[in-house]
Interface confidence: low
């Protein structure tokens, strides 16, 4: 059976696969997924290994018309470095010389300057080029190699291993060499995989059942450390509760060097955030941190300084802490908008069982704003999801130059932010450089400001506008209001009407359904339309909703189904990558973000059309 990293190298024109007959004869044969000799995999960014021989594809020289054969894998050799060129060409790195079969009656695979059909290769059974099954470095744990990556294949007791092994151990622990020759270098680490006993690499907090892994002997950059945690279905540490900080202070007390945690300000337009999307509501900075120096966007926990946090450049090499298991957040169910009949007094706006109102003109200090909201039967608004935030931005009449009090504050416990309405903190969205909590000005209250409505801490004594929120009164079945310019069941936003397609459909079926309704799969023109759509679908239980974006027409170029330019994108992390396909909006914790899916997957969808009676504004000229 093929493991997910292995593939057969297929030429569509010959309908044949590469076959390593022997180390000196790399030829082709009828494709057979059970043949070890046809299985290959990437073992570094640029090396391809034969699974059967545990040797790497290479050439004797970078010249035209030399045989491609198998060599002992050497990550430093220029003659074993391959790259995917445009589309499905595979070539030797840095040269216009390609992996080729079929010219001049040659049985062997050759390096050749021609870039025709006989130099084009795909992963057998897919339309993808070989790089789509690329190499993912595996960072080791413990051992003696400072968390270095596994070197595959590696030699142990004169035998080659292309995977982690428990060879030489009686306890089944999986390990790998971190250099090609373990026998000589004796460098190794344990693999970030599940195996009998791997649980003992973790420390479980008995109070919360959350597990922590302290990798104090490693030396990785922040991004590498994060990858290492993710390889274990975990994330870099987030700390949202004082108890959690206390537990970790104890766990790291015998250490001295800094350890990466998940806190970062890597997002271009927002502030401090945890990599696992936990809310940033508890602050434990070292005095003088966070320093505003550019580039210091990642955070370490300092065991030698009472486990306080310091921002550093992300390329520094440190140990790190991973976290997995039940989140420390209280479970807090946010009702889906569609589940809740929402009736609100005049001038209040309904959303997901609550009513909201912006008080822009009567400026008040935070304490008085809170009193006013409570007199009206509500509280300063709490915000629990990106959908709720996007509702406020897109449908409450929020303006880019607003600065409005919300209910978040750390008045009760310094450096521990809570909502004034007592609901748990499940979500935060700080502005870049926030929360700054400048000590010379006690900044205990929080405002929403700027075009995106992100948050900043502020001295509570400033007179500002504010947003109130209250529970809606349920009054029997909801009256479905027909919005002006839209048909029944459609929702209006600015110049357009939108409808959720409730039948699970492929991209093509969804597109056809929208067309039948004299509409089209939704386009998304800007941040505000995205905010509206996020609030429209984001709390629903289904995972995905099709948009009209795909690269069906031209692979690698994403276009809307209607002739409209792509002027705005909202990709999820690692998207669009190299995957061809159709684009759907996520719901849940990644609410609104765009993922590329296979076009024949089934999902719900959003249709869109011009509202009736709206004058079309002129198309922007580019």
């Amino acid at each position: 059976l093929l493991d997910t990293r292995q593939f057969l190298i297929y030429n569509e024109d010959h309908k044949r696969c590469v076959d390593a007959v022997s180390p000196s004869a790399v030829q082709t044969a009828a494709c057979n997924q059970d043949a070890e000799s046809q299985k290959f995999r990437w073992v570094s960014e640029s090396q391809i290994m034969s699974v059967a021989f545990k040797l790497c594809l290479g050439v004797p020289s970078k010249t035209d018309w030399v045989a491609i054969t198998l060599y002992a894998c050497d990550s430093k050799s220029e003659f074993q470095k391959w790259e995917c060129k445009n589309d499905t060409l595979l070539g030797i790195k840095g040269e216009d010389l390609f992996f080729n079969y079929g010219n001049r009656q040659e049985k062997n695979i050759m390096l050749y300057k021609g870039s025709g059909l006989w130099s084009r290769w795909k992963i057998y059974g897919t339309t993808d080029n070989l790089c789509s099954r690329g190499y993912e470095a595996m960072y080791t744990l413990l051992g003696n190699a400072n968390g270095a990556t596994c070197a595959f294949p590696f030699k142990f007791e004169n035998k080659w291993y292309a995977d982690c092994t428990s060879a030489g151990r009686s306890d089944g622990w999986l390990w790998c060499g971190t250099t090609t020759d373990y026998d000589t270098d004796k460098l190794f680490g344990y693999c970030p995989l599940k195996f009998e006993g791997s649980e003992s690499l973790w420390n479980k907090d008995p109070l919360t059942s959350v597990s922590y892994q302290i990798n104090s002997k490693s030396a990785l950059t922040w991004h590498q450390a994060r990858k290492s945690c993710q390889q274990q279905n975990a994330e870099l540490l987030s700390i949202t509760e004082i108890h959690e900080q206390t537990y970790l202070t104890g766990l790291t007390s015998s250490l001295t060097s800094g350890l990466w945690i998940g806190l970062n300000s890597l997002s271009f337009n927002s502030g401090w955030q945890w990599s696992d999307r936990s809310p940033f509501r508890y602050l434990n900075w070292l005095p003088g941190s966070p320093s505003a120096e550019p580039g210091k966007s990642c955070v370490s926990l300092n065991p030698g300084k009472n486990a306080k946090w310091e921002n550093l450049e992300c390329v520094q090499k440190l140990g790190y802490i991973c976290k997995k298991g039940n989140t420390t957040l209280n479970s807090f169910v946010i009702p889906s908008e569609s589940d809740v009949p929402t009736h609100c007094p005049s001038q209040w706006w309904p959303y997901a069982g609550h009513c909201y109102k912006i008080h822009r003109d009567e400026k008040k200090i935070q304490r008085d704003a809170l009193t006013t909201c409570r007199k009206e039967g509500g509280d300063l608004t709490s915000i629990h999801t990106i959908e709720e935030l996007d509702f406020i931005i897109s449908q409450l009449g929020y303006e880019p130059n607003d600065e409005l009090w919300i209910g978040l504050n750390d008045i009760k416990i310094q450096m521990y932010f809570e909502w004034s309405d007592g609901t748990p903190v499940t979500f935060t969205k700080w502005l870049r450089g926030e929360p700054s909590h400048e000590n010379n000005r006690q900044e205990d209250c929080v405002v929403m400001k700027g075009k995106d409505g992100y948050w900043a801490d502020r001295g509570c004594e400033w007179p500002l506008g504010y947003i109130c929120k209250m529970k809606s009164r349920s009054q029997g079945p909801e009256i479905v209001e027909v919005e002006k310019g839209c048909r029944k069941g459609w929702k209006k936003h600015h110049f357009y009407c939108y409808m959720i397609g409730h039948t699970l459909s492929t991209f093509a079926e969804a597109n056809q359904t929208c067309n039948n309704e004299n509409a089209y799969l939704t386009t998304i023109e800007d941040r505000y339309e995205q905010a509206f759509l996020t609030s429209f679908v984001g709390l629903r239980p289904e995972k995905y909703f099709w948009t009209g974006l795909s690269d069906i027409q031209t692979k690698g170029t994403f276009q809307w189904t209607i002739e409209e330019e792509v002027r705005f994108t909202h990709w999820n992390s690692d998207m669009p990558g190299r995957k061809p396909g159709c684009v759907a909006m996520r719901t849940g914790i990644a609410g609104g973000l765009w993922d590329v899916l296979k076009c024949d997957e089934k999902a719900k969808f959003v249709c869109k059309h011009w509202a009736e009676g709206v004058t079309h504004p002129p198309k922007p000229t580019t």
């Epitope: 413990l142 003696n144 060879a167 373990y182 006993g197 003992s200 973790w202």
Partner: nanobody, 119 residues
Framework: DVQLVESGGGSVQPGGSLRLSCAAS????????KAWFRQAPGKEREEVAA???????NYADSVKGRFTISRDNAKNTVYLQMNSLKPEDTAVYYC?????????????WGQGTLVTVSS
């Protein structure tokens, strides 16, 4: 090299208690993962309880709530307190230590101590 010596085994009636000790010859015992295993006649060796170098503990479902693993770094010793013993706990109990920072294959076993539970 590390030597592990178990003690504390013996015969006991169902419902009784025993405390097993495992003393190590090496001073660096605290940087090892320690575990107690057992092997009943005709059965495979199974892990009963483990304590990590960080102090976390894990137990097999069959002994949860009855057995407690602990360690005393100053004495280079790990203990297994066994309460509410049952006949099915009868086995040879082995202590094991895994060094997690040297070569891939340095784990050490004791010789075993016999525990018999019968009326």
């Amino acid at each position: 090299d590390v030597q592990l010596v178990e003690s504390g085994g013996g015969s006991v009636q169902p419902g009784g208690s025993l405390r097993l000790s495992c003393a190590a010859s090496a001073r660096i015992f605290s940087s090892y993962h320690k575990a107690w295993f057992r092997q009943a006649p005709g059965k495979e060796r199974e892990e009963v309880a483990a304590i990590t170098s960080g102090g976390s503990t894990n137990y097999a479902d069959s002994v949860k709530g009855r057995f407690t693993i602990s360690r005393d770094n100053a004495k280079n010793t790990v203990y297994l307190q066994m309460n509410s013993l049952k006949p099915e706990d009868t086995a040879v109990y082995y202590c094991k230590a895994v060094v997690v920072t040297t070569t891939p294959y340095s784990d050490y076993w004791g010789q075993g101590t016999l525990v018999t539970v019968s009326s």
